[in-house]
Amino acid sequence: MKVLQEPTCVSDYMSISTCEWKMNGPTNCSTELRLLYQLVFLLSEAHTCIPENNGGAGCVCHLLMDDVVSADNYTLDLWAGQQLLWKGSFKPSEHVKPRAPGNLTVHTNVSDTLLLTWSNPYPPDNYLYNHLTYAVNIWSENDPADFRIYNVTYLEPSLRIAASTLKSGISYRARVRAWAQCYNTTWSEWSPSTKWHNSYREPFEQH
């Protein structure tokens, strides 16, 4: 039994890191393998993660971690019984994939303005709380070409757009994702999408 693709890990910079790897053949990850991990810290203890299958030869492990700080470094040991298959380390702050924003809501009761709001996925004491920026994706269910991205580079988790920038009388969907420039993170997954019917009064045309 050998590791074909070494574990690569990403952290949500809060409490979970996810590590994925591939073996050289079909493997029952949960029965044959264990991933041991430990924060390099005087007051830390070793933890064991039981991996799950992720395709025939792929494995994935969700590591429960202490609140992350930038200096953290974890040792990782992948075991098959008594055999050490791979040894490595992981700095969560260097491999961050933020949590997805939640509670995306479209408020349509503001005069001819759409207000989209969502929740920051981090608590106020987390470093990323004040460092997230967002991308909002809006698309038409009727017209695949009607697809747009709004970059929200301010901290407030909201976006205002004129309803008239979208077509009236049809349904739209929106979703939002996050990233943090300070740690050069990847983008989060998209939030669940939300749907609304866009309607607004056309301005009266004079001839």
Partner: antibody
Framework: EVQLVQSGGGLVHPGGSLRLSCAGS????????MFWVRQAPGKGLEWVSG???????NYADSVKGRFTISRDNAKNSLYLQMNSLRAEDMAVYYC?????????WGQGTLVTVSS | EIVLTQSPGTLSLSPGERATLSCRAS???????LAWYQQKPGQAPRLLIF???SRAPGIPDRFSGSGSGTDFTLTISRLEPEDFAVYYC??????????FGQGTKVEIK
């Protein structure tokens, strides 16, 4: 807002015992290492003890064998049991959250050791 | 055990002046594990700088940290009246734990 609220200081005779408490709020207590740091009157800061998320502990040589740090994650609370107290243990004791450094501190509680 | 020595013991300056505080370690310290604190009379210490040069949340940009190895510096670019206090450096070591310097008092001249 992260808060650490301390209680339990007071006057004790040499050789006596005292238990300090620290209640945390505004953060996930169970995912953070916690510490006690003290400051003798007019002196600098001295690290006393720390406890990891899994219960691993460490002590300064000056208190080893006499002080015991513990935590109750269900109550978001940190404790310091101080036995065989000496005159040199007299100080303001602070609880703190942290790891390699201490990012949030309690208000401090005075422990006076005097006969 | 790593010993941190701060200098000067006392720094007498006027508001608006630049303050430079030194922290010297008896052996090399990882920059990731060097921090600075401010303490005012009757108050708990407050984290200013961690990782030798990163400002803690809410700390004004007139505070900056620098250095590596055994020599570290805290600089206050223009002293405000509320900056007069005692400043401590602190390090963490995987074997010895946590130690503080003896402090530098920044007082009004």
């Amino acid at each position: 807002e992260v808060q650490l609220v301390q209680s339990g200081g007071g006057l004790v005779h040499p050789g006596g015992s005292l238990r300090l408490s620290c209640a945390g709020s505004g953060f996930t207590f169970s995912r953070n290492a916690m510490f006690w740091v003290r400051q003798a009157p007019g002196k600098g800061l001295e690290w006393v003890s720390g406890i990891g998320t899994g219960g691993a502990t460490n002590y300064a040589d000056s208190v080893k064998g006499r002080f015991t740090i513990s935590r109750d994650n269900a109550k978001n609370s940190l404790y310091l049991q101080m036995n065989s107290l000496r005159a040199e243990d007299m100080a303001v004791y602070y609880c703190a959250r942290g790891r390699y450094y201490f990012d949030y501190w309690g208000q401090g509680t005075l422990v006076t050791v005097s006969s | 055990e790593i010993v941190l020595t701060q200098s000067p013991g006392t720094l007498s300056l006027s508001p608006g002046e630049r303050a430079t505080l030194s922290c010297r370690a008896s052996q090399s310290v990882s920059s990731s594990y060097l921090a600075w604190y401010q303490q005012k009379p009757g108050q708990a210490p407050r984290l200013l700088i961690f990782g030798a040069s990163s400002r803690a949340p809410g700390i004004p940009d007139r505070f900056s940290g620098s250095g590596s190895g055994t020599d570290f510096t805290l600089t206050i670019s223009r002293l405000e009246p509320e900056d007069f206090a005692v400043y401590y450096c602190q390090q963490y070591d995987h074997s010895a734990g946590w130690t503080f310097g003896q402090g530098t008092k920044v007082e009004i001249k």
